[in-house]
Amino acid sequence: MVPPPENVRMNSVNFKNILQWESPAFAKGNLTFTAQYLSYRIFQDKCMNTTLTECDFSSLSKYGDHTLRVRAEFADEHSDWVNITFCPVDDTIIGPPGMQVEVLADSLHMRFLAPKIENEYETWTMKNVYNSWTYNVQYWKNGTDEKFQITPQYDFEVLRNLEPWTTYCVQVRGFLPDRNKAGEWSEPVCEQTTHDETVPS
């Protein structure tokens, strides 16, 4: 009897949908695996007789519940199927946005770039998929614990009237208010402000 794949799960970030599993202990030799998806009531092969422990399902429709399954094989024997259900638009993890930061005197000017999507045109981003897409920004004075959060209305934001000659750190994430779903934070970007722009009287 061939044992089934273990710890079968979907690892999906920005609709890059990778079905992953672990190979069970099997004394007779090396196992291969077949992964399938349900399409119009028929299971279709996606990865056949692979020695890998993952299979790319990024070409699935972003909408709807998909039934995926994987089994282990050895010679003419095979395990039972292990099934999972996956809805990309609900289940995919929102990866960190890009961010450009520029210092202008005592201000930080930030521009945000929505994450790109696997198997899509360059210009079709997570912002196109989710109508309620917005950004959360948090910033703090470097070396302090207190963090401030803002929700920009646009793809850019300016933090004004900051302390001069002080290093501030900023990070951004995507947020979907209608789903109350937050994405992953970007890596902090830390920049030092320069002089105060106000002219002495």
């Epitope: 070409s59 699935l60 429709s61 972003k62 909408y63 638009v89 198997n119 899509e120 045109y121 210009t123 079709w124 196109n128 998929v129 109508n131």
Partner: nanobody, 124 residues
Framework: EVQLVESGGGLVQPGGSLRLSCAAS????????IGWFRQAPGKGLEGVSC????????HYADAVKGRFTISRDNSKNTVYLQMNSLRAEDTAVYYC?????????????????WGQGTMVTVSS
């Protein structure tokens, strides 16, 4: 259920232009994304372009960027693909497709309804 009918294909010389039309029965605004795809002889289906109904944003495959322009006339329930500077490698059957959920643009899996296609041949 929407029905899509493509027209405007034909034979054109390299460097020439064509405008494809995709007429949708019913209200095309019910379908948030309309896309154009093509299938060259002996090749797989390839995304060309799409247009979003809500904000009218347009998106293109690298191979056609700067040469093709997608547009839509909601009053006529029609989407157009203006193809300029045509090349031999643009020869294909061109299909129009509509997405009911509008979540995707390039992947055929994200489209629910398809036209029958119109043939474009670029040859001298």
């Amino acid at each position: 259920e929407v029905q899509l009918v493509e027209s405007g294909g034909g034979l054109v010389q390299p460097g020439g232009s064509l405008r494809l039309s995709c007429a949708a029965s019913g209200n095309s605004l019910d379908y948030p994304t309309i896309g154009w795809f093509r299938q060259a002889p002996g090749k797989g289906l390839e995304g060309v372009s799409c247009i979003s109904a809500s904000e009218g944003s347009t998106h293109y495959a690298d191979a056609v960027k700067g040469r093709f322009t997608i547009s839509r006339d909601n009053s006529k329930n029609t989407v157009y693909l203006q193809m300029n500077s045509l090349r031999a490698e643009d020869t294909a059957v061109y299909y129009c497709a509509a997405s009911g959920h509008g979540l995707g643009c390039k992947s055929e899996a994200d489209y629910d309804y398809w036209g029958q296609g119109t043939m474009v041949t670029v040859s001298s």
